[in-house]
Structure formats: structure tokens, C-alpha cells
């Protein structure tokens, strides 16, 4: 069966309660023409910042064409949760759904979207909208990847040696230096899925007086600099 490509649109806005909200729906440029019978899975990987709100969308099919709308939610270490709406009886049903932050945006007969309020690390998982029509099913799937901004610190720990740490980020941050030095990088994995990256660098060349640690992460990039002193300097700390 024909299926759309994964050209995507990410919309972000501010809600009244000051939480950023993101909605990932298919870009209107993406749809192919001759849809037939059952659509193959259309899946999207979607990174979402922790503590924001997220809205997940179904395919654009009018309610008048539908029999059932189902959201299937598979989170790590939990049984599959399903939220279903049956148009004929105007009833909704939930199975194995315990997270009260995952809800329909509004009444499913008005809006089939799913919302996650205040995204947490535990919301990492797979979300799928299944729209049942008389002629087959339309699917839209999301691999939701929750992003956690690491805390970045930079300090000098001994003569001409600096340490840059990106603490508890998800996924792991990448650390680079300007200028390049003699560096060693270690990663520490935490049980909640976050990673601490520690990069220790030494500069033998004495004409290097200031070094910059650049931390790259999906939530944003951060640069900190420090002057190399003969004795350890002040600690610098920042959030991305």
C-alpha cells in the first residue's frame, strides 16, 4: 500500500502554565496519492524535552469515516496500554493505562490527538494511533525519546588540566575542546537512562592560556571557558 514519507513538522509554543508544548504531526507536504486498504506502519522517531507537554496526532481522517480510534502505548517495563474510542456507541475504553498524564487532548469525537502532560523519563516508548475504517486501518506511530538537559561544569583540577562534565543528560552529550588537548573521556550510565560524560584534558603547550569546553546535546549546545592557571581555578557551572 502507498504510504507517506516521513517529512515532518515540529511545532513549539508556550502554554499558559509556562510549560513548553510540542506537537509532532505530519507535514502537509508528505502525503502520497493512492491510499489503498491497509496502510503499512508510518513511524517517526521523536525527541521531546523532559518537563514539556507533548501532543501526538493521528492520520488526517474525518470522524465520519471512522469506526474505532485506538491509541496503543508501550512503555518500558509496563504492560501495553490502550485507549480506544468507538464511534457507534460514543464510548471510550482504557486497558492497562495507569499514567494519568497521558490522556486524550479532548473528547475523542472532537479531537483524536493524545497528549502527555509534563513529559518524564518514564514516557520513553512507542505510541501508535490506529484508525479503523470500513476499508482498512490507518496507522501513525511515534518512537518517543525523552531528552534530559545535562548540567555542565568546567574546572581546573591540576596544573594545565581541565575537567568538563555534562551530568545526567539523555542521550549522552558530546564534549569537544578548543584548542584540542590531550584528552580522555569517560561515560557513566545511570539507572534512569541518563548519562554523565566527563572529559579531562591536559595542555602541555604553554602559550595556551584559555580553553573552551563545548558541549553538544539534542536539547541545545553550551560553551564554557576557563583560564589555565598554575593552581586550580574557580569552578564554573551551567545548564544548557
Amino acid at each position: 500500500a502507498a504510504q507517506p514519507n516521513n517529512s515532518l513538522m515540529l511545532q513549539t509554543s508556550k502554554e499558559n502554565h509556562a510549560l513548553a508544548s510540542s506537537s509532532l504531526c505530519m507535514d502537509e507536504k508528505q502525503i502520497t496519492q493512492n491510499y489503498s486498504k491497509v496502510l503499512a506502519e508510518v513511524n517517526t522517531s521523536w525527541p521531546v524535552k523532559m518537563a514539556t507537554n507533548a501532543v501526538l496526532c493521528c492520520p488526517p481522517i474525518a470522524l465520519r469515516n471512522l469506526i474505532i480510534i485506538t491509541w496503543e502505548i508501550i512503555l518500558r517495563g509496563q504492560p501495553s496500554c490502550t485507549k480506544a474510542y468507538k464511534k457507534e456507541t460514543n464510548e471510550t475504553k482504557e486497558t492497562n493505562c495507569t499514567d494519568e498524564r497521558i490522556t486524550w487532548v479532548s473528547r475523542p469525537d472532537q479531537n483524536s490527538d493524545l497528549q502527555i502532560r509534563t513529559v518524564a523519563i518514564t514516557h520513553d516508548g512507542y505510541y501508535r494511533c490506529i484508525m479503523v475504517t470500513p476499508d482498512g486501518n490507518f496507522h501513525r506511530g511515534y518512537h518517543l525519546q525523552v531528552l534530559v538537559t545535562p548540567e555542565v561544569t568546567l574546572f581546573q583540577n591540576r596544573n594545565r588540566t581541565a575537567v568538563c562534565k555534562a551530568v545526567a543528560g539523555k542521550p549522552a552529550a558530546h564534549i569537544s575542546w578548543i584548542p584540542e588537548g590531550d584528552c580522555a573521556t569517560k561515560q557513566e550510565y545511570w539507572s534512569n537512562g541518563t548519562v554523565t560524560v566527563k572529559s579531562t584534558c591536559h595542555w602541555e603547550v604553554h602559550n595556551v592560556s584559555t580553553v573552551t569546553c563545548h558541549v553538544s546535546h539534542l536539547t541545545g549546545n553550551k560553551s564554557l571557558y576557563i583560564e589555565l592557571l598554575p593552581v586550580p581555578g574557580a569552578k564554573k557551572s551551567a545548564k544548557l
Epitope: 511545532q11 509532532l24 502537509e28 496526532c57 465520519r64 469506526i67 457507534e88 483524536s112 470500513p134 476499508d135
Partner: antibody, heavy 119, light 110 residues
Amino acid sequence: QVQLVQSGAEVKKPGASVKVSCKASGYTFTSYVMHWVRQAPGQGLEWIGYINPYNDDTNYNEKFKGRATLTSDKSTSTAYMELSSLRSEDTAVYYCAREDYYGSRWGYWGQGTLVTVSS
Amino acid sequence: DIVLTQSPASLAVSPGQRATITCRASKSVSTSGYSYMHWYQQKPGQPPKLLIYLASNLESGVPARFSGSGSGTDFTLTINPVEANDTANYYCQHSRELLTFGQGTKVEIK
């Protein structure tokens, strides 16, 4: 291929009723919503309503409620639009159109049926 | 009901030029990142023909000279470059709730 073939032209007197048919072929008739639209001479398109042959759900433009009746016959894959209490301003070409699922667009139309209301 | 207002009512364009038709909805026809706005072309004695669906998607078999844009309440159909056989009436239509059409734009080729 998908085809919607409508019944022939009709001439009716004011106060009478007319029933226009739309025979579908090339797809499963009960799987798709059918809309009805009319176009008076030299005028634009006016939505009358739709019927879902799967469950016989209907929905009408407020203007036509009580006067238009949409029905379907699954055995012959035919949709019908009946308009009662005809008046001269109902003179128009009446079209059926199939709604496709994705995007709710109308990809297939009947050829149109001219209904003339004249005393 | 959502009211669709098309402008201009008529348009005369020379071949090779650009024709632009706008359609304004009385309230948003967009939801979940999709705009339920479509554009149709109708030539005399024929039923309408779908050109653009969901605001910007080109229907199969329609020349790439036709394009659509917009979201929320404001939408545009563009024909560039215009050809002689583009003489027709053009209608916008929304399908989000109960359905309505714009009043139409007559495009004539000079």
C-alpha cells in the same frame, strides 16, 4: 476503476419531489462516505449532505434539513438524493462525490444530473 | 458553519503569468497539524476536479504548475505559469466539520 454514474435529467413541477441516483462501481460501496452537492445555473457549489453507506449515518446542510433525504442501497451500490417540495430555485445540476479517507478530499465525482423545476 | 470567502471573484491572466487565488475561512480549518482545505477546478459542463488537498498536496495527475499554501484561516492557490486550458472556475472547500465551498473564482486567459 472508480466510477460514479448518475441518473438522467429530470423536469419537475413546483411542489413535486425528485430522486436522483448515483451508482458506484470499482470499489466497495459501503466503505466510503458519499456527498451530494448542487450547482444552480451560473452559481457556485452548495453542499447538501452526506451518507455513510457503512452504517447509514447521514448529515445535512441546515438549509436542506427536512427537504433532502439521502439513502443508499447496498445491494446495487447506489446512493440516492431525494429533494421534496421543489421550487424554481432548486433548478440545478446535482452531483454525488466520494470522499477519500486520507485528508477527507473528494477524488471522484458523478457526471451530474440536471433537475429543472418549472411550472 | 464555517464561511469561506474567495478573492478575487474573477481574474484575467496572460499565458505564462502567475495567477493567485485566496480563500479565507471564518474560523480555523486546521487541526493536528493538518489544514482540511482543498481546491477544485471546474470547467463548463463538467464536474469539479480535485487539484490540491490538505492545503498543499498536489492530487495525482495534476500538473505541478498548481500549488497550494496556507494554514489556519488563510489559504492560497497559485497557478504558475498559467496555460490557455486553465480557463475555469476554481473553488476552495473545507472538510473539517460540515462542509462548505467558497463562492468561486473565474479565471480567464487573455
